[in-house]
């Protein structure tokens, strides 16, 4: 469906309110640092020229890519050196070079101020003082912070941003109305822009094969009376689209997956009795339902899969037609049947059956040798539910924070080298696995807990990758995407780590610390943590549990005293002191 | 357009035996798994046997296990049902359709007519 205007198709698909958003959202995740104005002014002017163009495609520039239009457009920008410094280089490229050179400049820890939440009554007079300038702020915000955050899913947000204020600015008490559904939108938007960051790794850094692979397997799970055919369509479709977010191309991702939304819709009755009630919902609503739909019911008299795959005579002929067909196939066959298993446990086991049929289907006796392909499964499966099993437990009988605090020790005796932000955030992330996950019944915790490893493990990995400093890290981060978490889980203490200097000054505190927010509180208490270990590596529990009592108690207690800031300078210096004794520093 | 088109059916004696064939076409025939039903005079479509796509795995009702033998050959955009040792009770029109265990209903070809009678 070739278009003479290209930016004049798009434009009359979405509509001018979602093409200025999904412009803005593009423009504010290539060039992090900008000036919100600055950005409003440069979506206005793509905007007036998206017009023209819609009255007339054949008008001068109409034809361009957008791709080329857009990086037109960022590269008028003044200040793009001193700014970006090496990415203003991009703008001496010509298209497809420049956009890839943009996305390579992308930063996923950008250096910007923390978000902070101001008053209620000043959110609700700025909102109701210019609605339209206060939801294009939000899209902003959270669009440089997040610059690989799943645009069309981002207007869904904002929706739902806007709907709160509407709600609660009017409410008795607007506090109480606004600040949970404000957390909410918070945590799910982290989550969300998390788990697609793992989708554009998966893209990005192990190729299109390695997506369409985990897309079949979801997909299969999900949608299990589905027919492979259908499946197969499906992961097409949804490949194209989160390529395109994924490569910035926000404008063709958003309607390929409204296009996508409908289809399935249009098609419910032969992918899933679970669609209906997601299906009867406006767009941006439908298509965050179905992506997050459950699964539907298994089919009933499901055939052994030993028949297909291992017993039949015709294995290697299948594999060698259409080896990428039939492994596709098979996972299909394995996940349709296995809710009950992670999608990345699904994508070993047929890493497993492929690298067997690779070595049998050229033995003398191929059927003899892949006869027992099946039992090799069984350690594979095993390895994730012990590990779930162990954590769970430690969860149950810890609770979150000290479950965080085990992980955070065990992470940073791990890789010590990476930075303690880092290592805080990330082990904080993989506690909340144990919330997250360990409520649910034994068929619905591995899929939970181990997909949702991979997506911070995943955080781990791409911010490691802006400033790597452990090989181990880097190792298991590039080798195999799937097998990223046993790789991890796999790591011992590391034996070549040169302890940290001691420096009194990471371990000294102030009154400031009794005004925070527990969250924030536990964060101080974490960090400190982290420090510890790095300063003494060998430290064992115990030690580390008695030192963290103690700070705990002299935090508490200095937090009660009339004179904190007194308290903290002479308690602190004891408490050094002590804890440098204890642990031998 | 996707087509299906039955044969085989024919009248038989109890105890005898027949193969239907379907041949399907304006569809990736390997990417689906496919399904017997069949309908006897007076009566609502019955489900017989299911084949998974790379068409090793089979399903069959009740009625029919050890009786009937379902396969496909993907190469020739073909599958079969094999009846053997056949009853009164399975005459019937015979129809090959697009899935697995299909419990949607799916558009029906002309089918092929099972008599068993003596």
């Known amino acids: 469906d070739a278009h003479k205007s290209e930016v004049a198709h798009r434009f009359k698909d979405l509509g001018e309110e979602n093409f200025k958003a999904l412009v803005l959202i593009a423009f504010a995740q290539y060039l992090q640092q900008c000036p919100f104005e600055d950005h409003v002014k440069l979506v206005n002017e793509v905007t007036e020229f998206a017009k023209t163009c819609v009255a007339d495609e054949s008008a001068e520039n109409c034809d361009k890519s957008l791709h080329t239009l857009f990086g037109d457009k960022l590269c008028t920008v003044a200040t793009l050196r001193e700014t970006y410094g090496e990415m203003a280089d991009c703008c001496a490229k010509q298209e497809p070079e420049r956009n890839e050179c943009f996305l390579q400049h992308k930063d996923d820890n950008p250096n910007l101020p923390r978000l902070v939440r101001p008053e209620v009554d000043v959110m609700c007079t700025a909102f109701h003082d210019n609605e339209e300038t206060f939801l294009k702020k939000y899209l902003y915000e959270i669009a440089r912070r997040h610059p690989y955050f799943y645009a069309p899913e981002l207007l869904f947000f904002a929706k739902r941003y806007k709907a709160a204020f509407t709600e609660c600015c009017q409410a008795a008490d607007k506090a109480a109305c606004l600040l949970p559904k404000l957390d909410e939108l918070r945590d799910e938007g982290k989550a969300s822009s998390a788990k697609q960051r793992l989708k554009c790794a998966s893209l990005q850094k192990f190729g299109e094969r390695a997506f369409k692979a985990w897309a079949v397997a979801r997909l299969s799970q999900r949608f299990p009376k589905a027919e492979f055919a259908e499946v197969s369509k499906l992961v097409t479709d949804l490949t194209k689209v989160h390529t395109e977010c994924c490569h910035g191309d926000l404008l063709e991702c958003a309607d390929d997956r409204a296009d996508l939304a409908k289809y399935i819709c249009e098609n419910q009755d032969s992918i899933s009795s679970k669609l209906k009630e997601c299906c009867e919902k406006p767009l941006l609503e439908k298509s965050h339902c179905i992506a997050e739909v459950e699964n539907d019911e298994m089919p009933a008299d499901l055939p052994s899969l030993a028949a297909d795959f291992v017993e039949s005579k015709d294995v290697c002929k299948n594999y060698a037609e259409a080896k990428d067909v039939f492994l596709g196939m098979f996972l299909y066959e394995y996940a349709r049947r296995h809710p009950d298993y992670s999608v990345v446990l699904l994508l070993r086991l047929a890493k497993t059956y492929e690298t067997t049929l690779e070595k049998c289907c050229a033995a003398a006796d191929p059927h003899e040798c892949y006869a027992k392909v099946f039992d090799e499964f069984k350690p594979l499966v095993e390895e994730p539910q012990n590990l779930i099993k162990q954590n769970c437990e430690l969860f149950e009988q810890l609770g979150e924070y000290k479950f965080q605090n085990a992980l955070l020790v065990r992470y940073t005796k791990k890789v010590p080298q990476v930075s303690t932000p880092t290592l805080v955030e990330v082990s904080r992330n993989l506690g909340k696995v144990g919330s997250k996950c360990c409520k649910h019944p034994e068929a619905k915790r591995m899929p939970c807990a181990e997909d949702y490893l991979s997506v911070v493990l995943n955080q781990l990995c791409v911010l490691h990758e802006k400033t790597p400093v452990s090989d181990r890290v880097t190792k298991c981060c590039t080798e195999s995407l799937v097998n990223r978490r046993p790789c991890f889980s796999a790591l011992e203490v590391d034996e070549t780590y040169v302890p940290k200097e001691f420096n009194a000054e990471t371990f000294t505190f102030h009154a400031d610390i009794c005004t925070l927010s527990e969250k924030e509180r536990q964060i101080k208490k974490q960090t400190a943590l982290v420090e510890l270990v790095k300063h003494k590596p060998k430290a064992t529990k115990e030690q580390l549990k008695a030192v963290m009592d103690d700070f705990a108690a002299f935090v508490e207690k200095c937090c009660k005293a009339d004179d904190k800031e007194t308290c903290f300078a002479e308690e602190g210096k004891k408490l050094v002191a002590a804890s440098q004794a204890a642990l031998g520093l | 357009e996707v087509q299906l088109q039955e044969s085989g059916g024919g009248l038989v004696e109890p105890g005898g035996s027949l193969r239907l064939s379907c041949v399907a076409s304006g569809f990736t025939f390997q990417h689906y798994a496919m399904s017997w039903v069949r309908q006897a005079p007076g009566k609502g479509l019955e489900w017989v046997s299911s084949i998974s796509v790379v068409g090793g795995g089979t399903s069959y009702a009740d009625s029919v296990k050890g009786r009937f033998t379902m396969s496909r050959d993907n190469a020739k955009n073909t599958l079969y049902l094999q009846l053997n040792s056949l009853k009164s009770e399975d005459t019937a029109m015979y129809y090959c359709?697009?899935?697995?265990?299909?419990?949607?209903?799916?558009?029906l070809g002309q089918g092929t007519l099972v008599t068993v009678s003596s």
């Open positions: 359709v697009r899935g697995w265990h299909p419990d949607v209903p799916r558009p």
